[in-house]
């Protein structure tokens, strides 16, 4: 290839100069000149840069608010920012995680196709013809009817996706 | 104080090869290519190739190709050239040298700013 | 490849003299670099971008040029003067060098 049309990769140009960017946990002091080094500092406690960067603040971690139902998934270091997630029961509103919002229950007729996690929110579905929910539930799956046949009862009252069928004793033929 | 320190004199016998260190310090390594230049006996000095050590991208003098391997060890901030099928005409001094870019109104351009202190490499039977 | 052609190669001077070196492109190039070694020694950069002299460099050394013709200037010679320059550029791939030029006592 021939000579660059810019700067090299981990470079950047200030004042006619291609200078050295920051490496990710640091921040820039003083940029490099055509007889010094780029001087760069490493970022302070609860702090961090994650790119090649010529930032002379550091961003500050994330905090996890416990008012808004976070906590701490992931320390952050000088390189990475805190990762926060949801308490128990409760889910992220976004993907930047900022505040949190307590699990979908699935209603009576529906059940749950993927349980919620910190970052996602229950999942339901409707109870399909030979299952049921009678519950209003963030756990319970659709359960399926009970089978009469198998305990040599008959069906007295049919299921719906929201109750289970009645099983009764068979009639005895009367001679 | 950016400084290339290269590693010590070599006597090599024809049809081997031989691997020259340079280790860097005082700036940020992988951010600056880094080069190799030989110098033979009273001679001029004549580019071998290059290396950018933040991915080991690199360019060969069409001379030296299929002859010559540049690398570098990041973890220890260390540039190696390594010649092979050694000939007596690869008697010289090897040297390493940083890379420097700048822009000047127009055309980004590039030269030496530090160099190491050689490396003697003899050719002999 | 672009050759660099230096003249002379060999420079015999007494100190005070004006010495003049030229660097000759087999194509235009943007800019000229120069780089001064003494034996037993690596090169230093010594004048960069035509013109600009690198840190510590002496006010009697200068440099000028353009298209296929540089020159390295030096008003006075002063007996640390005294070793081979070089001229290189980076213009075109790959990078390439002058063939040096001795400047010795006279």
């Known amino acids: 290839p021939e000579p660059p049309t810019a700067c090299r990769e981990k470079q950047y140009l200030i004042n006619s100069q291609c200078c050295s960017l920051c490496q990710p946990g640091q921040k820039l002091v003083s940029d490099c000149t055509e007889f010094t080094e780029t001087e760069c500092l490493p970022c302070g406690e609860s702090e961090f840069l994650d790119t090649w960067n010529r930032e002379t603040h550091c961003h500050q971690h994330k905090y996890c608010d416990p008012n808004l139902g976070l906590r701490v998934q992931q320390k952050g270091t000088s390189e990475t920012d805190t990762i926060c997630t949801c308490e128990e029961g409760w889910h992220c509103t976004s993907e930047a995680c900022e505040s949190c919002v307590l699990h979908r229950s699935c209603s009576p007729g529906f059940g749950v196709k993927q349980i919620a996690t910190g970052v996602s929110d229950t999942i339901c579905e409707p109870c399909p013809v030979g299952f049921f929910s009678n519950v209003s539930s963030a756990f319970e799956k659709c359960h399926p009817w009970t089978s009469c046949e198998t305990k040599d009862l008959v069906v007295q009252q049919a299921g719906t996706n929201k109750t289970d069928v009645v099983c009764g004793p068979q009639d005895r033929l009367r001679a | 104080e950016v400084q290339l320190v290269q590693s010590g004199a070599e006597v090599k016998k024809p049809g081997s090869s031989v691997k020259v260190s340079c280790k860097a310090s005082?700036?940020?390594?992988?951010?600056?290519?880094m080069h190799w230049v030989r110098q033979a006996p009273g001679q001029g000095l004549e580019w071998i190739g290059n290396i950018d050590p933040s991915n080991g991208e690199t360019h060969y003098a069409q001379k030296f190709q299929g002859r010559v391997t540049i690398t570098v060890d990041k973890s220890t901030s260390t540039a190696y050239m390594e010649l092979s099928s050694l000939r007596s005409e690869d008697t010289a001094v090897y040297y390493c040298?940083?890379?420097?870019?700048?822009?000047?109104?127009?055309?980004?351009?590039?030269?030496?700013?530090?160099w190491g202190q050689g490396t003697t490499v003899t050719v002999s039977s | 490849d672009i050759q660099l052609t230096q003249s002379p190669s060999f420079l015999s001077a007494s100190v005070g003299d004006r010495v003049t070196i030229t660097c000759s492109a087999s194509s235009s190039l943007s800019y000229m670099h120069w780089y001064q070694q003494k034996p037993g020694k690596s090169p230093k950069r010594w004048i960069y971008?035509?013109?600009k002299l690198a840190s510590g460099v002496p006010s009697r050394f200068s440099g000028s040029g353009s298209g296929t013709e540089y020159t390295l200037t030096i008003s006075s010679l002063q007996p640390e003067d005294f070793a081979t320059y070089y001229c290189q550029q980076w213009s075109s791939n790959p990078w390439t060098f002058g063939g040096g030029t001795k400047v010795e006592i006279k």
């Open positions: 005082g700036y940020t390594f992988t951010s600056y290519w």
């Open positions: 040298a940083r890379e420097r870019i700048y822009y000047s109104g127009s055309t980004y351009d590039g030269y030496f700013d530090v």
């Open positions: 971008d035509t013109s």
